[in-house]
């Protein structure tokens, strides 16, 4: 069964900067990745970025840079322009559309006890959907 993992990491040097890492574990080719916050895409979440494996990226504030890390994983750098970051208690979700598996989505957030520079473990939280 395919799985999606999500890591949320606070940057040690910049407390208002976060990076979301997402990956797809499974066979098949990825056709699109959607990253949202505040909930799953299309279920109350706000879209932050869309990444296509051939055609590039579209991203929305506060996303700073979305990019492919490997053929099956992406990263999204986020930056809060305000003094205090709204990201600490926020849920980030990544949806991978793949062929022939369909769409798989998982969500994660920064662990409450995280020190800057530490990240959430790369395990999917219970919100895992196959469309």
């Amino acid at each position: 069964t395919p799985e999606v993992w999500v890591q949320v990491q606070m940057e040690a040097t910049e407390l208002s900067s976060f990076t979301v890492h997402c990956g797809f574990l499974g066979p098949g080719s990825i056709s699109l990745v959607t990253v949202s916050w505040g909930g799953p895409d299309g279920a109350g979440g706000t879209k932050l970025a869309v990444l296509h494996p051939e055609l590039g990226t579209r991203q929305w504030a506060p996303a700073r840079q979305a990019r492919w890390e490997t053929q099956s994983s992406i990263s999204l750098a986020l930056e809060d322009s305000g003094a205090s970051s709204p990201f600490a208690n926020t849920t980030f979700c990544c949806k991978f559309a793949s062929f022939p598996e369909g769409s798989w989505e998982s969500c994660g957030s920064l662990p409450p006890s995280s020190d800057p520079g530490l990240s959430a473990p790369p395990t999917p939280v219970p919100i895992l959907r196959a469309d």
């Epitope: 706000t46 879209k47 296509h52 494996p53 055609l55 590039g56 990226t57 929305w60 504030a61």
Partner: antibody
Amino acid sequence: EVQLQQSGPELVKPGSSVKISCEASGYTFADYNVDWVKQSHGKSLEWIGAINPNDGGTSYNQKFEGKATLTVDKSSTTVYMELRSLTSEDSAVYYCARWVNNDWYFDVWGTGTTVTVSS
Amino acid sequence: DIVMTQSQKFMSTSVGDRVSITCKASQNVRSAVDWYQQKPGQSPKTLIHSASSRHTGVPDRFTGSGSGTDFTLTISNIQSEDLADYFCLQHWNYPYTFGGGTKLEVK
């Protein structure tokens, strides 16, 4: 026919602000993002940023953050770009362009707005 | 930022000829490249998207090719109305960046 009609030329003083518009017609406004591009005289093109008409979500080239602000008025199917603290470097033609979300490219360009900054 | 280099600033050609305009990306951008034509005093017009897909209504004299870092716009059977500037654009990473442009002169 899909059209992006931009506002007319602007002659503005250094240090001031200007707000230019891009009125969309001939398609479902909410279905396409609108991006803005700068063309300085005799030079190439620079991508400024984009706006999603659905929720007003924006994305900017870091070079233009603090310089350009994009807004949308869904009732008039118009996107606006405000440029502030103008200098001679901001003198250029500014274009809006429609982004096709499913195909990932600009398919229609606006008529262009010339902004001249001069005292 | 990704730099898109159009090394030929000017190209001169004759009606009926074939010309290739090149664009080189400073890093792999897969197929996330488009080509735009801008005639004097006009707004840009879309020719090619996704490196090789012709935009609706564009004559088949215009062909796009390439992937990764090297891209080419080929115009065959050049017509006088092809006098224009041609720009490439990458949308692989933010910020999107354009090439410096190639001005095509038709003799």
